[in-house]
């Protein structure tokens, strides 16, 4: 064996092992003939931290008084210093500081199921800083008596690998724990505990659900638990959902019943067990059954709108429009709407099963009284009909709602608001305001959206389908009985310049004035409702000021007349349009000579 | 008493690989970086490679001249630092020893606490 100190020792006193805030005595000493040769007071010792000189002396020997140590451990290494050579490695040691042991705390222990073992766990205080055994001792009844050790360096939790079994579930068993160091030892308070207090039952497992003829309302939650368990806790939630409905349940011998779960919907479940009604603790919570409930019959009345288009002196055209049933309306996946058209006095009848759609369009002769009835159905049968009887909706003058204004709200959001109509207010049942994105054409394609207001309201927030820069048709009917009154406006949410002024596409002459056509701007380019057109014109080639007309701006409208142009003269023209946010840039420029005769 | 004894040094041709053991008594070594050294006969001590106290999982470093053949590692268990050295030249001749040490490793020599008596690498064809 290599002598690693053949040149000297590196002795420490009291110990190598000291409390914190002690002092320590190192003493480097040279073995004899080991000095520096021919040189022996020529002896230079030097004492090390780590790599930090800390003391030097000249002799055979040097004695150092050390303090302040930190926690933990510290090396310390004497070399001895020849002239005309380098330092010789003497000798090292370490000092390990630290403390005694805290007395461990709340001390508790479990067995994890009837078959588990007993493991306990302890809080330890502060670290030591030092190697810390731990003894674990267990005695029981009839003098029996059980021991672990721990020599882990942070050792907290302990197994016995030994199982309590339930022959006498009162007997009495006592835990402790003692902590031991080279600086002290310490030892928890005795924990006292039964069979039934520390054992924690295995989480149930293999859970099952059943619902008896497919109803929601019979619904049988199982599953298995270890032989001694008394009670049960469930908790479930539908999936979607972060509450937890709780059940408190004792004998259930693995199964419960199951009242207030909602139809069509993913539930989670988990159980949990216990052995006594107030001893030991609750199991984990299983792991989750997640499972999809039944469907029942749709309940309420799906939101029926409509829209009537005249086509011809004897036919009209209607389209159907609804909404969906919320989730807990539908109770299951809609199938199919049913549609049902009947002409009241003659009373033919159709019937029409619309899936994948929420809206149906028909043509009807313009005579005779008709209702439409609109309902919803899952695999287990159909909502309640929804019943319209198709009218005129703003036949009746006397019903419109007056001085309907629609302005910006925030983002994506029109407030609408209006007042009762002239005719008696108090006759309004119900106000609808309806909203279509503006399309010139009056393309019946684009969706149409609605809601419904009670008759006592006179404004309404729009914000479904709302887009930014995009112009909505926007309509406030009054209903009252088998009459309907309204009033329209346009209206955007948000807005700005359009970004293109309409493209004139003709200029015809008509007796001593001219007739310009247009194209409509594209509806992405037009970023909000416009107001006005303008049409300009000046003569080629000239400096002046342009003239120009201003034309309200209508859906339909696109051609307009201009009679102040000099026959024979050669004219520029061009057209803008404009929003409330301001003008957009010329439009394409025509040039036009009038061949007339001059006045 | 602090020790560290190397050993696993021998004679070995160009192109060879030799692994070096160094094991350490008297002190508690888990708590320690570690570094190899070595020293070529007529020259100073040259730092090798060094490795971070801890588990076997501590960061590694390296001299450029050793870069991807030599390979250190630690056993806190058996209290043994290891060498691996392979693709040997005849300028990896040197006294190999090890050391606890205190980093940094990068741009200069780390700082020694305690060192071996080393042990004797030859290559040479």
């Known amino acids: 064996k290599i002598d690693a100190c053949k040149r000297g020792d590196v002795t420490v006193k009291p110990s190598h092992v000291i409390l914190l805030g002690s002092t320590v005595n190192i003493t480097c000493s040279l073995k004899p003939r080991q000095g520096c040769f021919h040189y022996s007071r020529r002896n230079k010792l030097i004492l090390y931290k780590f790599d930090r000189r800390i003391n030097f002396h000249h002799g055979h020997s040097l004695n150092s008084q050390v303090t302040g140590l930190p926690l933990g451990t510290t090396l310390f290494v004497c070399k001895l210093a020849c002239i005309n050579s380098d330092e010789i490695q003497i000798c090292g040691a370490e000092i390990f500081v630290g403390v005694a042991p805290e007395q461990p705390q709340n001390l508790s222990c479990i067995q994890k199921g009837e078959q588990g073992t007993v493991a306990c766990t302890w809080e330890r205080g502060r670290d030591t800083h030092l190697y810390t055994e731990y003894t674990l001792q267990l005695s029981g009844p009839k003098n029996l008596t059980w021991q672990k050790q721990c020599k882990d360096i942070y050792c907290d939790y302990l197994d016995f690998g030994i199982n309590l079994t339930p022959e006498s579930p009162e007997s009495n068993f006592t835990a402790k724990v003692t902590a031991v160091n080279s600086l002290g030892s310490s030892s928890s308070l005795p924990s006292t505990f039964t069979f039934l207090d520390i054992v924690r039952p295995l989480p149930p497992w293999d859970i099952r659900i059943k619902f008896q003829k497919a109803s929601v309302s019979r619904c049988t939650l199982y599953w298995r638990d270890e032989g001694l368990v008394l009670l049960n806790r469930l908790r479930y939630r539908p999936s979607n959902s972060r509450l937890w409905n709780m059940v408190n349940v004792t004998k259930a011998k693995g199964r419960h019943d199951l009242l207030d779960l909602k139809p069509f919907t993913e539930y989670e479940f988990q159980i949990s067990s216990k052995l006594h009604l107030y001893k030991g603790s609750w199991s984990d919570w299983s792991e989750s059954l997640r499972a999809q409930t039944p469907e029942e019959e749709p309940t309420g009345m799906l939101d029926v709108w409509y829209m009537k288009r005249h086509i011809d002196y004897s036919r009209q055209q209607i389209s159907l429009f609804w909404k969906n049933l919320s989730v807990s309306e539908a109770r299951g996946k809609i199938l199919h709407y049913q549609v049902t058209l009947q002409e009241l006095t003659g009373g033919k009848a159709m019937t029409q099963n619309i899936t994948g759609h929420t809206s149906w369009t028909t043509v009807i002769p313009r005579t005779g009284n008709w209702a439409v009835a609109v309902s919803a159905a899952n695999s287990k049968g159909s909502s309640l009909p929804t019943r319209i009887n198709i009218m005129n909706l703003c036949e009746a003058g006397l019903l419109a709602p007056r001085q309907v204004s629609a302005n910006s709200e925030g983002m994506d959001n029109i407030l609408v608001t209006w007042q009762p109509p002239r005719k008696d207010p108090s006759a309004v049942q119900e106000y609808v305001v309806e909203w279509r994105e503006l399309h010139p054409g009056g393309d019946t394609q684009v969706p149409l959206n609605w809601l419904r207001s009670r008759p006592y309201n006179v404004s309404a927030l729009i914000s479904e389908n709302i887009k930014s820069y995009i112009c909505y048709e926007i309509r406030v009917y009054a209903l009252s009985g088998d009459q309907g009154g309204c009033s329209s406006i346009l209206g955007n949410s948000k807005h700005k310049a359009p970004l293109s002024g309409p493209h004139i596409n003709a200029i015809t002459e008509e007796k001593g004035s001219i007739l310009i056509s247009w194209n409509s701007i594209p509806v992405q380019e037009q970023m909000g409702c416009l107001l006005h057109y303008r049409i300009y014109w000046k003569e080629r080639d000239s400096n002046s000021q342009p003239q120009l007309c201003e034309i309200p701006y209508r859906v339909s409208q696109n051609s307009h007349p201009i009679n102040s142009l000099q026959p024979r003269v050669t004219y520029v023209l061009w057209m803008t349009a404009l929003t409330a946010a301001g003008e957009s840039s010329h439009g394409n420029e025509r040039e036009f000579c009038l061949q007339g005769k001059a006045n | 008493q602090v020790q560290l004894v190397e050993s696993g040094g021998g004679l070995v041709q160009p192109g060879g690989s030799l692994r070096l053991s160094c094991a350490a008594s008297?002190?508690?070594?888990?708590?320690?970086?570690m570094s190899w050294f070595r020293q070529a006969p007529g020259k100073g001590p040259e730092w090798v490679s060094a490795?971070?106290?801890?588990?076997?999982?501590?960061?590694?470093y390296y001299a450029d001249s050793v870069k991807g053949r030599f390979t250190i590692s630690r056993d806190n268990a058996k209290k043994t630092l290891y060498l691996q050295m392979k693709s040997l030249k005849p300028e990896d001749t040197a006294v190999y020893y090890c050391?606890?040490?205190?980093?940094?490793?990068?741009?200069?020599?780390?700082?020694?606490?305690?060192r071996g008596e080393g042990t004797q690498v030859t290559v040479e064809p």
């Open positions: 490795i971070d106290k801890g588990g076997g999982a501590g960061a590694t």
């Open positions: 050391a606890i040490t205190a980093g940094p490793y990068s741009d200069s020599t780390p700082r020694v606490a305690y």
């Open positions: 008297g002190f508690t070594f888990e708590p320690y970086d």
